[in-house]
């Protein structure tokens, strides 16, 4: 039995920040779980982890180069990514594992979310306004 995951197909980070919501077909309330966010088509780079259990505060881990926070809903984990760089534009996959109570469960691979990080383009003001017409 696998947990199903829904993600937005695409998100645009205009201000170098984005909220990526991972919605699960499973209620995480009073469960011990590990939710993670993976970068790249092969999910090779794990960039954020949210660990939760019934007795402790939510714990959030960010890989060096990523600034991550996490929020828990009954059937969702939202990853808040800040200070993103243009070169971090990629596809990101949500993963979930539930360890307790048994049985161990994980998810079917989701379709992922393309996060497009838009660079901040400042409008150039002309240094020289040019000759004024009489």
């Amino acid at each position: 039995n696998k947990i199903l995951v829904k993600q937005s197909p695409m998100l645009v980070a205009y201000d170098n920040a984005v909220n990526l919501s991972c919605k699960y077909s499973y209620n995480l309330f009073s469960r011990e779980f590990r939710a993670s966010l993976h970068k790249g088509l092969d999910s090779a780079v794990e960039v954020c982890v949210v660990y939760g259990n019934y007795s402790q505060q939510l714990q959030v881990y960010s890989k060096t180069g990523f600034n991550c926070d996490g929020k828990l809903g009954n059937e969702s984990v939202t990853f808040y990514l800040q200070n993103l760089y243009v070169n971090q534009t990629d596809i990101y996959f949500c993963k979930i594992e539930v360890m307790y109570p048994p049985p161990y469960l994980d998810n079917e691979k989701s379709n992922g979310t393309i996060i497009h990080v838009k660079g901040k383009h400042l409008c150039p003001s002309p240094l020289f306004p040019g000759p004024s017409k009489p």
Epitope: E32, R34, E46, V49, Y51, Q59, Y61, T64, E97, M99
Partner: nanobody, 124 residues
């Protein structure tokens, strides 16, 4: 809940070698990392080395690069620290740590569980 048990500490002469082991037990996820930190008397606990479950990410403190090697046996849930060319300044209590992060984190705050520590003494 994760339990960590270290072994392998002892006294050795400068230039000598030791191998530390740390066995983890409890509920494990598909990825996590384990690391070694050390604490000399009167000093802060400092990062030594770390490795993740997939063994595709390892990191070392500059002071031990080329002398120490971290490895792990996933079947035994055990991580090892091979220490060669030991120096007097390596004398410390060595602690094994466990983190739910899936990379070789050098940040002490990322580690959720700690072993009891094993003493390494390097002296002539």
């Amino acid at each position: 809940e994760v339990q960590l048990v270290e072994s392998g500490g002892g006294e050795v002469q400068p230039g000598g070698s030791l191998r530390l082991s740390c066995a983890a037990s409890g509920r494990m996820f598909s990825n996590y990392a384990m690391g070694w930190f050390r604490q000399a008397p009167g000093k802060e606990r400092e990062f030594v080395a770390a490795i993740n479950y997939r063994r595709d990410d390892a990191d070392y403190a500059e002071s031990v690069k080329g002398r120490f090697t971290i490895s792990r046996d996933n079947a035994k849930n055990t991580v090892y620290l091979e220490m060669n060319s030991l120096r007097a300044e390596d004398t410390a209590v060595y602690y094994c740590g466990f983190t739910y992060a899936g990379w070789a984190s050098s940040r002490r705050d990322d580690y959720n569980y700690w072993g009891q520590g094993t003493l390494v003494t390097v002296k002539p």
